[in-house]
């Protein structure tokens, strides 16, 4: 999906109002310096591309974050503010349904969410290019 035509300000507002708080809740009890950020993003479409991939793609040691509150709110924000996004996400929805069966917070998932926080912070930088 090409995130170029999203309403970035609306997504930013959704992040600031709820998604950021859900990410903090998920990371509660973890020191902010515990994980090194190894990925970043260039402009807002890039940030959303990486946020979407990191949130919904299973990775080694962290089978799925898709069932978490921040992930569901991220999906909703992208569906509302990115034209045509919902139509591209049928397979992702199936993955989310499967993921709901188990909800285990591993250290690798904490590290992944720490990376997500970094990508969202980068997305929100005032000087970051729209596209």
């Amino acid at each position: 999906y090409d995130f170029t035509n999203c309403d970035f300000e609306k997504i930013k507002a959704a992040y600031l109002s709820t998604i950021s708080k859900d990410l903090i809740t998920y990371m509660s009890g973890t020191k902010s310096t515990e994980f090194n950020n190894t990925v970043s993003c260039s402009n807002r479409p890039h940030c959303l591309t990486e946020i979407q991939s990191l949130t919904f793609n299973p990775t080694a040691g962290c089978a799925s974050l898709a069932k978490e509150m921040f992930a569901m709110k991220t999906k909703a924000a992208l569906a509302i503010w990115c034209p045509g996004y919902s139509e591209t996400q049928i397979n992702a929805t199936q993955a989310m349904k499967k993921a709901r069966k188990s909800k285990v917070t591993t250290n690798k998932c904490l590290e992944q969410v720490s990376q997500l926080q970094g990508l969202w912070r980068r997305f929100n930088r005032p000087l970051l290019k729209q596209q």
Partner: antibody
Framework: QVQLQESGPGLVKPSETLSLTCAVS?????????WSWIRQPPGKGLEWIGY???????SYNPSLKSRVTISRDTSKNQFSLKLSSVTAADTAVYYC??????????WGQGTLVTVSS | EIVMTQSPATLSLSPGERATLSCRAS??????LAWYQQKPGQAPRLLIY???SRATGIPARFSGSGSGTDFTLTISSLEPEDFAVYYC??????????FGQGTKVEIK
């Protein structure tokens, strides 16, 4: 410390597909960062080709996108480049590199690929 | 595509002298700029990122400055091992990261 090593044929015929592999040691490619390919034609500057992130997202240079495929094999801790329909203009030293998806902090030593019949 | 233009193409200096290399972007890249050093037959090495932050293990004689469209790499006092080609790279314009054509710093 992370080390990267490119391997593959040094000579490819025009219209064929260039295939290179980058073996990574000292760091798991599924643990963090992105893993990138960059090339440098003889005596010229650098051109970014694309990357694959540790979680599988892929990004390509638009000028090469139609011909490029980057993939990975986490079991072997390596990633690969395929460039189709090559011409003499694709003759270059090809580097693999570790990236934070913005800039490139560790590089392989590079491998020269010549496109010629 | 953002075009990165480096000047001069070649800089002839003696060890101990100060080197000032310029990189100009065709449009603003904020501080999304990196500098690399490349010696003959070797891979590039990251020197500076975010326009002014030194990469791990890079000596303090290397410094970067600038924002927007104009950037400078300064080597305060050239050591013999600093004679090489230097490239700038912008990473503001994903997915079209671009490099400058390079500045060669040679021994006078």
């Amino acid at each position: 410390q992370v080390q990267l090593q490119e391997s593959g044929p040094g000579l490819v015929k025009p219209s064929e597909t260039l295939s290179l592999t980058c073996a990574v040691s000292g760091y798991s490619i599924s643990s963090g960062y992105g893993w990138s390919w960059i090339r440098q034609p003889p005596g010229k500057g650098l051109e970014w080709i694309g990357y694959i992130s540790y979680y599988g997202s892929i990004s390509y240079n638009p000028s090469l996108k139609s011909r490029v495929t980057i993939s990975r094999d986490t079991s072997k801790n390596q990633f690969s480049l395929k460039l189709s329909s090559v011409t003499a203009a694709d003759t270059a030293v090809y580097y693999c590199a570790r990236t934070n998806l913005l800039y490139f902090d560790s590089w392989g030593q590079g491998t020269l690929v010549t496109v010629s019949s | 595509e953002i075009v990165m233009t480096q000047s001069p193409a070649t800089l002839s200096l003696s060890p101990g002298e100060r080197a000032t290399l310029s990189c100009r972007a065709s449009q603003s890249v904020s501080n999304n700029l990196a500098w690399y050093q490349q010696k003959p037959g070797q891979a590039p090495r990251l020197l500076i990122y975010d326009a002014s932050s030194r990469a791990t293990g890079i000596p303090a004689r290397f410094s970067g400055s600038g924002s927007g469209t104009d950037f400078t790499l300064t080597i305060s006092s050239l050591e013999p091992e600093d004679f090489a080609v230097y490239y700038c790279q912008q990473y503001s314009d994903w997915p079209q990261y671009t490099f400058g054509q390079g500045t060669k710093v040679e021994i006078k």
